[in-house]
Interface confidence: low
């Protein structure tokens, strides 16, 4: 990624370097781990020692939200922090050695998306520079979490649960319940992203039903009551 | 169900090193979720230590980063904690502790009884 | 680090008297969890993401709250609730002091 916002137009008699920007388009870690969103730059300014501001932003170039933000004060190769979200972004490169690299601990599924170093030179030479394609973060992996399960009015006076889980692998999704055997045929459907649903389409007893979803890293379950009185289903989670 | 159990010397000196182990029932360390080492100072301050996940993968306070090492007995089902140069700060109950993660945050949902550590001098 | 601050540190309520507890965070955090420990014993789950009942937890027991501000909220307290809550964010490992419960 050797594109970015160039702002500073003044010549300069035979540079060793352009501006220019080094990340990769992508970066894989499981949910719960930590990564590294590598990023290096070269610049026109031979022997910059003024101060500097190196800044992560998400979702989109130059107007995403900030993430994480530093500054080093002239001739300092400490970069003090300013802004890090949630406490978990941290400076792994040296920005005085061209390296802008950033550790994100503890990953969440929604910290998957797009990320864009910039390098800030506010002193006399005054100049910045900001990745525009970005490093793509994918986070996978999550143990199973239920995110929905309701009664539903089915055919004939009947009823139908409803269990909705997220997971990454997808989680099996299992019933069980009054029925004889304390177990019911659930009908798995195909889910979106991350979710999974099953579905069991008669409820012949009233009682506690129980949806629970594992997969290779945990499992997890939740409870929904029929009472039938008046036709009308009484529900609880 | 699954159950914890701390075990280890209650009384460790200055400057050397405490060495506990979690001992799991009912669960396979290897099948999933992250296993924690969690410390309780006197006047009940809760301190998050560090975890090995299933994977065996590691993960650490950065306040402890230089002292503390957490590995596994897959054989046992146990994982150990290992904390180096102990000062009497260090003094405080210890719990090893089962963390689930679901995507989105994490949480301790299995503790184990705790066991206390004092630093002597 | 995001710091969280437990008020108050100590309260005292009366049988059957609804307690709200606050936990208050430095920064927004998307999540809050919270723990309940009796006097001599280990800490136990007692909602998880803000708002969720750990296992066997009695429904007098209720969570809510968004970015820097969460509460626990007790109902009607019992005896039995006298002891130590503590809440906890997961995105950088922190727990709260704590509230002491005591019952009058």
């Known amino acids: 990624d050797a594109s970015g916002d160039l702002l500073n137009t003044e010549a300069h008699s035979a540079p060793a370097q352009r501006w220019s920007m080094q990340v990769p388009a992508e970066v894989n870690a499981e949910a719960g781990d930590a990564a590294v969103l590598p990023c290096t730059f070269t610049h026109p300014h031979r022997h910059y020692d003024g101060p500097l501001t190196a800044i992560w932003r998400s979702g989109e170039p130059y107007a995403g939200p900030q993430v994480f933000r530093c500054t080093a004060a002239p001739g300092s190769e400490l970069c003090q922090t300013a802004l890090s979200l949630h406490g978990r972004f941290r400076l792994l490169g040296n920005p005085r050695r061209n390296d802008l690299s950033l550790r994100v601990e503890r990953l969440a599924l929604a910290d998957s998306g797009r990320y864009f170093c910039r390098v800030e030179f506010t002193g006399d030479a005054h100049d910045r520079y900001e990745s525009r394609h970005g490093v793509r973060l994918r986070v996978t992996a999550a143990a199973p979490r239920i995110v929905n399960i309701s009664v539903l009015p089915g055919p004939a006076h009947a009823f139908r649960a409803l269990c909705t889980a997220e997971g990454e692998p997808p989680p099996a999704l299992a019933w069980s319940g009054p029925a004889p055997g304390n177990s019911s045929a659930a009908l798995q459907g195909q889910g979106h992203g991350y979710q999974v649903t099953a579905e069991l389409p008669a409820l012949t007893r009233d009682g506690r039903y129980t949806c629970t979803a594992a997969n290779s890293l945990g499992r997890a379950e939740a409870s929904v009551y029929l009472f039938r009185f008046h036709g009308a289903p009484g529900t609880s989670t | 169900d699954v159950q914890l159990q701390e075990s280890g010397p209650g009384l460790v000196k200055f400057s050397q090193s405490l060495s506990l182990t979690c001992s799991v029932t009912?669960?396979?360390?290897?099948?999933?979720?992250?296993w924690n080492w969690i410390r309780q100072f006197p006047g009940n301050k809760l301190e998050w230590m560090g975890y090995?996940?299933?994977?065996?993968?590691?993960n650490y306070n950065p306040s402890l980063k230089n002292r503390i090492s957490i590995t596994r007995d897959t054989s046992k089902n146990q994982f150990f904690l290992k904390l180096n140069s102990v000062i009497t700060e260090d003094t405080a109950t210890y719990y090893c502790?089962?963390?689930?993660?679901?995507?989105?945050?994490?949480?301790?949902?299995?503790w184990g009884t705790g066991t206390t550590v004092t630093v002597s001098s | 680090q995001i710091v969280l601050t437990q008020s108050p540190a100590i309260m005292s309520a009366s049988l059957g008297e609804e307690i709200t507890l606050i936990c208050s965070a430095s920064?927004?955090?998307?999540?809050m969890h919270w723990y309940q420990q009796k006097s001599g014993t280990s800490p136990k789950l007692l909602i998880y993401?803000?708002?969720n009942l750990a296992s066997g937890v009695p429904s007098r027991f209720s969570g809510s709250g968004s970015g820097t501000f969460y509460s626990l909220t007790i109902s009607s307290v019992e005896a039995e609730d006298a002891a130590d809550y503590y809440c906890?964010?997961?995105?950088?490992?922190?727990f709260g002091g704590g509230t002491q419960l005591e019952i009058k």
């Open positions: 502790v089962r963390e689930i993660y679901d995507g989105s945050s994490g949480y301790f949902d299995v």
């Open positions: 009912g669960y396979s360390i290897t099948s999933g979720y992250y």
């Open positions: 920064s927004s955090v998307s999540y």
């Open positions: 906890h964010q997961w995105s950088s490992w922190t």
């Open positions: 090995i996940r299933h994977d065996g993968s590691n």
């Open positions: 993401r803000t708002s």
